[in-house]
């Protein structure tokens, strides 16, 4: 029959090659000459040429040694054709199974494996898993079946069998109690992997087991008693550093100390923190100590670790005796910050207030006073009594020195101790407003058209406080009311300025008097630029031929003509004419275009 059973070929065959494996035979060879061929991976496709066939005999040939670890099975097709090339059989499956030889040693996946386990753990605790691979077959043979074992352990303390390894999984576990990091921090195991399930080739590797720290050592004070001297009143003063030793891993939570004051600090005067580098307890004052109240404190300090203890351990306690040293204390102003109401503008020499300090020391010390900071130089202070008087004019509206009606002064008290000490106090003068400022309009320069002019709204400001401000009243003075009107709005905080008669293009002064609710009057001159235009304007259109200064000049054009015609004499004429024109400016403007202005205003 045109069938071939699976062919088993051992890997790593010695040859000689080509090696005959099996003969393909078609029973059609009785009728015609048959030519045989094979196809498939290993024959005519990669890896080409592993197998061949003798075309006329049908012998299947192996051309080279096989490697099961590279290709474990080849699937080929056998073909039979007659002399004329016609196929005489269907393609036949040829299975070539490569059988395994134990040609590979086990290989550990790492040269060195690293694992860790907590000190003091119970036997049976898993540490780590090691792995060795073997490329040989582990399904049909034992060639690739790996068995693990521990060859040696270093050090052999407390004895030489602290660990075991599972022969098939490679899991390393603790087998004995007594792991103590403080005695043996690390074990080095030489491990073996042997194929043929322990009867074949062996390879070795190293497993390093780190013993992890458990908090099985309490911190201990060295020494246990401390004595310290601290000046009174100092906050944040380092009183004492307390030192501990701990056998656990430095800088770990099991080593880092946590300190607590467990007695002797009823007034909550002290705090203790852990120094991050030295692990010492740094005892400092949280509040100033008062020698006069208590000259000695006996503190009890307990130490634990950041991490809880892994086993039951005693807690260490230290005693710190703190002696308070007397110091000359500074006088203290009562209150430290004093608020006084005083009217602005009071006469020089007028008393403002008395501001005194007390000395905490038991001795009756003499206190003298002086002003430390008085930005405007408005005050003086009696050195003996602490009486504060005005020596300058207190001005609430002085924005350089006064903020939100308050003028701030710093005063100093000095005792006569040895050495003398000083204390400061803050005097906050709340200045009461008086009506010492009149209202002022903003802006003080306007530009307006002389035809269909737009009303100019000016804001009114008054530096004083209510009721010395709005409502305001407005009045035009110095004949300004001939050409202008000024009206205060309903709210009384703006004034509306309007041009009521035609004025030629020029600059004019409008005299505006404003008074506040307390009848404080303020005269302001508004500079009005009148332009030849209609409605709203920002700047005058066209070439500006405005006059000079407050009066302005109406004779610019004439002056130019006169200069052209007469030369030197023209200068004198121009001066004369200019002066006359300037004086008669408002009258000339009125006569010139009275008719046109009349039409505009009526419109």
């Amino acid at each position: 029959d045109w069938v071939v059973a699976p062919i088993s070929v051992p890997e790593n065959g010695k040859g000689p090659f080509p090696q005959r494996l099996n003969q393909l035979k078609s029973n059609k060879d009785r009728d015609t000459k048959i030519f045989y061929s094979i196809t498939g991976p290993g024959a005519d496709s990669p890896p080409e040429g592993v197998f061949a066939v003798e075309k006329e005999t049908g012998w299947l040939l192996l051309n080279k040694p096989l490697d099961r670890e590279e290709i474990a099975k080849y699937e080929l097709f056998g073909h039979a054709v007659s002399e004329n090339g016609a196929s005489v059989e269907d393609p036949m499956n040829i299975s070539i199974i490569v059988t395994d030889q134990n040609d590979h040693k086990p290989k550990f996946t790492q040269d060195t494996f690293r694992g860790s386990v907590l000190e003091g753990v119970l036997p049976g605790t898993s540490v780590m898993q090691v792995t060795a691979t073997d490329e040989d077959d582990a399904i049909y043979t034992y060639n690739g079946v790996v068995a693990y074992s521990i060859h040696s352990q270093e050090p052999k303390d407390p004895h030489d069998l602290m660990f075991t390894i599972h022969r098939s999984t490679g899991t390393i576990s603790v087998i004995s109690s007594g792991l103590d990091r403080e005695k043996v921090p690390e074990y080095t195991l030489t491990i073996q992997a042997t194929d043929m399930d322990g009867d074949g080739s062996t390879t070795t590797a190293v497993a390093v087991v780190e013993i992890l720290d458990a908090n099985d050592n309490a911190p201990m004070f060295e020494p246990q008693k401390y004595e310290a001297w601290v000046p009174e009143n100092e906050v944040g003063h380092e009183v004492q550093r307390l030192t501990v030793t701990d056998l656990d891993v430095p800088n770990s939570p099991a080593w880092r100390a946590t300190y607590h004051i467990v007695g002797g600090d009823d007034g909550d005067h002290f705090t203790i923190t852990t120094h991050p580098e030295t692990n010492q307890g740094v005892l400092t004052t949280k509040k100033g100590l008062d020698f006069e109240a208590q000259d000695q404190h006996t503190l009890y300090v307990e130490v634990t670790n950041e991490a809880p203890f892994a086993v039951k351990l005693p807690t260490a306690t230290a005693t710190v005796v703190v002696h308070v040293k007397d110091v000359n204390e500074a006088p203290v102003f009562v209150p430290p910050s004093k608020v006084v109401e005083v009217q602005e503008g009071i006469p020089t020499g007028e008393p403002v207030c008395v501001y005194t300090a007390e000395d905490p020391d038991k001795e009756n010390q003499k206190i003298s006073y002086r002003i430390l900071r008085d930005p405007a130089g408005w005050l003086a202070m009696d050195p003996d009594s602490g009486q504060v008087t005005a020596v300058g004019t207190l001005d609430r509206e002085d924005e350089q020195f006064v903020r939100n009606n308050i003028y701030e002064v710093m005063v100093l008290a000095m005792d006569n101790g040895s050495p003398p000490t000083t204390g400061t106090g803050t005097l906050l003068l709340t200045l009461i407003d008086v009506n010492d400022h009149g209202p002022v309009p903003e802006p003080r320069q306007i530009t307006i058209c002389n035809q269909s002019p737009v009303r100019q709204v000016l804001n009114i400001t008054d530096k004083d406080l209510s009721p010395h401000t709005s409502p305001f009243q407005a009045q035009l003075t110095d004949d300004s009311d001939i050409y202008w009107t000024a009206e205060v709005n309903e709210e009384g905080d703006t004034v509306v300025l309007s041009l009521k008669k035609f004025l030629k293009q020029d600059t004019y002064d409008v005299h505006l008097s404003l008074s506040d609710h307390g009848n404080k009057e303020q005269l302001t001159v508004i500079r009005a630029t009148v332009c030849d235009c209609h409605g709203h304007v920002e700047t005058c259109p066209g070439p500006w031929k405005g006059g000079s200064g407050g009066g302005g000049s109406g004779a610019g054009v004439i002056a130019v003509i006169v200069v052209v015609v007469i030369a030197i004499v023209a200068g004198i004429v121009v001066l004369v004419i200019s002066r006359k024109k300037r004086m008669a400016k408002y009258e000339k403007a009125e006569i010139k275009e009275m008719g046109e202005m009349h039409r505009e205003l009526n419109a």
């Epitope: 040859g15 090659f17 080509p18 000459k33 030519f35 061929s37 080409e48 040429g49 061949a52 066939v53 003798e54 075309k55 006329e56 012998w59 040939l61 051309n63 080279k64 040694p65 054709v81 002399e83 090339g85």
Partner: antibody, heavy 121, light 107 residues
């Protein structure tokens, strides 16, 4: 065993074709592979391809696919190689060489005397 | 394509001397290596196949060795008729490839 390349030296024009023959005697022609090898003047040997006359199976060097066509006539025990679209690069001596069938892994044990092909206009 | 590297490219020797020619394959060809001798204007002649088997009628002063990728042809006691060009050839995988040749000349 004897391989005789019967066609004498060939002088052909570029673009033309030439067919070289190789007559075998002294062995079973249809049961051995016939190889063809090219040698340019002063150069080494270059394998073109082979044919198994028994069933006409061919195998070519990729470089000569489309250039060389191998055929065999069992009745006259003659192998042929046709070279097409000739250029000056095809000017060479062409050898036929027998290879016994042993899974086609045998060396070429008998060689023809060679046919010289010159391509020139 | 498998590359065959032959060395030396040329070699001068005297009659009676022993010479060795080497051939390196770019991949494993096991023992499938042949050596040929070609004289000027003649066709190549098979000397050795399967790396070390001498072809019929080849004198025993010729010997082949090697396997895998490294091969050599040794000629003991050179004779005048041994001068010519020698080629190695892979007869394992197609395309069959030849070395570039070693030209052996009389010193």
């Amino acid at each position: 065993v004897q391989l005789v390349e019967e066609s004498g030296p060939e002088l052909v024009k570029p673009g033309a074709s030439v067919k070289i023959s190789c007559k075998a005697s002294g062995y079973a022609f249809s049961s051995s592979w016939m190889n063809w090898v090219k040698q340019r003047p002063g150069k080494g040997l270059e394998w073109i391809g082979r044919i198994y006359p028994g069933d006409g199976e061919t195998k070519y060097n990729g470089k000569f696919k489309g250039k060389a066509t191998l055929t065999a006539d069992k009745s006259s025990s003659t192998a042929y190689m046709q070279l097409s679209s000739l250029t000056s690069e095809d000017s060479a001596v062409y050898f036929c060489a027998r290879q016994r069938d042993y899974g086609a892994l045998y060396a070429m044990d008998y060689w023809g005397q060679g046919t010289s092909v010159t391509v020139s206009s | 394509e498998l590359v065959m590297t032959q060395s030396p490219a040329s070699l001068s020797a005297s009659v009676g001397e022993t010479v060795t020619i080497t051939c390196r394959a770019s991949d494993d060809i096991y023992s499938y290596l042949a050596w040929y001798q070609q004289k000027q204007g003649k066709s190549p002649q098979l000397l050795v196949y399967n790396a070390k088997t001498l072809a019929e009628g080849v004198p025993s002063r010729f010997s082949g060795s090697g396997s895998g990728t490294q091969f050599s042809l040794k000629i003991n006691s050179l004779q005048p008729e041994d001068f010519g060009t020698y080629y190695c050839q892979n007869h394992y995988v197609t395309p069959f490839t030849f070395g570039a040749g070693t030209k052996l000349e009389i010193k």
